[in-house]
């Protein structure tokens, strides 16, 4: 859990991930126009990738491409379109020195404010003390307790639970999500929500202040939804929303509720039936890995403004290659 705001370490600037296992390129001949500038003695322009700043997308960021494009036409500029997700975790700490050499001006430098503790509304400051296993790798932090910026996804592991939903997805309307109660009041809130119908199952968050509840019927769930914003126990305002966490629903569906409970329907005079078979397969409340991957996909979407240059494979060029060794 250490170091939420630390920039992810990418490969070193000089490393070439495509070198290993790649086919060797044709031997360069006398035609120097096919040689990249850095092989001809030119000083390469320093390229510093600029990750997305906290305050918003930075435009015109160039992606580093392999300089070893020998044997083809000169590389075309590739401009990535920024796929910014609102509320996505920042990749730069607000404590990093933004105006470091080579970075130029970013949106933050022009309007930096002193002592920013909470950036924008969704981000919440959580105090951390260096030396307690939460080192922030920042010289400014040494010996000073200060705020670590947590993204909503870090605060709430289900922040991205709706990201994987598509228009074709069918959500189970008998599930609701209840939130906003203190952890100590969870069982009390559960008692209250069992008044609105037969709860078959509920899944508690590991932080304890929200839960997914499955009712026996959609009608009962709708009744629970109508309690959104209601105050319980004089001081606890509760939110109730339809559950959008597919993983909880799907794992519950796999349990195959063979006999939904008819419990507490007074006219029926049968013995008590459980709402759940005892051999219920265990389900996990963690997000499926796929969700996590979807939430952390690349911030930059590469869009080439021209067709990618291909090596000329015509008969004439092959003859020229054979004759001149190009």
């Amino acid at each position: 859990m250490a170091a939420f705001a630390v920039e992810p370490q990418g490969p070193a600037l000089g490393s070439e991930p495509m070198m290993l296992g790649s086919p060797t390129s044709p031997k360069p001949g006398v035609n120097a126009q096919f040689l990249p500038g850095f092989l001809m003695g030119d000083l390469p322009a320093p390229v510093t990738p600029q990750p997305r700043s906290i305050s918003g997308p930075s435009v015109g960021v160039m992606e580093m491409r392999s300089p070893l494009l020998a044997g083809g036409s000169p590389p075309q500029p590739v401009v990535p379109a920024h796929k910014d997700k609102s509320g996505a975790p920042p990749v730069r700490s607000i404590y990093d020195d933004i105006s470091s050499p080579g970075l130029g001006s970013t949106p933050l430098t022009s309007r930096r404010q002193p002592n920013i503790s909470v950036m924008q509304s969704p981000l919440v400051g959580v105090t951390s003390t260096p030396g307690t296993g939460q080192s922030m790798f920042s010289p400014a932090s040494i010996g000073q307790p200060r705020k670590t910026t947590l993204s909503p996804a870090q605060l709430d592991p289900f922040y991205t639970q709706g990201d994987s939903l598509t228009s074709e997805d069918h959500l189970d309307d008998s599930w609701v999500t209840v939130f906003g109660f203190p952890q100590a009041s969870a069982s009390y809130i559960l008692l209250q929500f069992a008044q609105y119908g037969n709860i078959l199952k509920h899944v508690m968050s590991n932080t304890g202040n929200w839960m997914h509840i499955r009712y026996q019927s959609k009608l009962q769930a709708r009744k629970a939804l109508s309690k959104d914003g209601r105050i319980f126990g004089e001081s606890i305002m509760i939110g109730v929303k339809p559950c959008i966490d597919k993983s909880v629903m799907e794992s519950s569906d796999r349990c195959a509720l063979s006999s939904p409970s008819l419990a507490f329907t007074p006219p029926i005079k049968t013995l008590g039936t459980p709402t759940q078979p005892g051999s219920t397969p265990r389900i996990s409340t963690m997000r499926p890995l796929a969700t996590a991957y979807k939430a952390s996909t690349s911030d930059y979407q590469v869009i080439s403004d021209r067709q990618t240059p291909k090596k000329d494979e015509s008969l004439v060029s092959k003859a020229m290659e054979y004759m001149f060794g190009w």
């Epitope: 069982s187 559960l190 078959l200 899944v203 459980p274 389900i283 409340t285």
Partner: nanobody, 120 residues
Framework: QVQLVESGGGLVQAGGSLRLSCVGT????????MAWYRQAAGKEREVVAG???????HYADSVKGRFTISRDNAKNTVYLQMNSLQPEDTGVYCC??????????????WGQGTRVTVSS
């Protein structure tokens, strides 16, 4: 597999007492919560009393001081002692037990209910 069977209901005069029992056929001693609910004709279900996670108890305002919920883990039983019964206490009383099946995942079990009628 847990099944809940209630007993102890019946007809009683106003001011009288009844003791409801809910026996779990299966281990309910580790229950997360245990509660009694009631539903009167034409009314919504309401929580009467509950033993919350941690052992504290909760009572509806209308029964405070008159009803007492308790549990006997050795007998896998939850009780509801009802004193000074009033006609408005009439209804079907149902037992509800919540058991943690896996970490953070809880299964809910309901009894069929036992009818309590308080005549004036």
């Amino acid at each position: 597999q847990v099944q809940l069977v209630e007993s102890g209901g019946g007809l009683v005069q106003a001011g009288g007492s009844l003791r409801l029992s809910c026996v779990g056929t299966g281990n309910i001693s580790s229950a997360y919560t245990m509660a009694w609910y009631r539903q009167a004709a034409g009314k919504e279900r309401e929580v009467v009393a509950g033993i919350l996670n941690g052992g504290s108890t909760h009572y509806a305002d209308s029964v405070k001081g008159r009803f007492t919920i308790s549990r006997d883990n050795a007998k896998n039983t939850v009780y509801l002692q009802m004193n000074s019964l009033q006609p408005e206490d009439t209804g079907v009383y149902c037992c509800h037990v919540v058991i943690e099946s896996t970490r953070f995942v809880y299964d809910h079990y309901w009894g069929q209910g036992t009818r309590v009628t308080v005549s004036s």
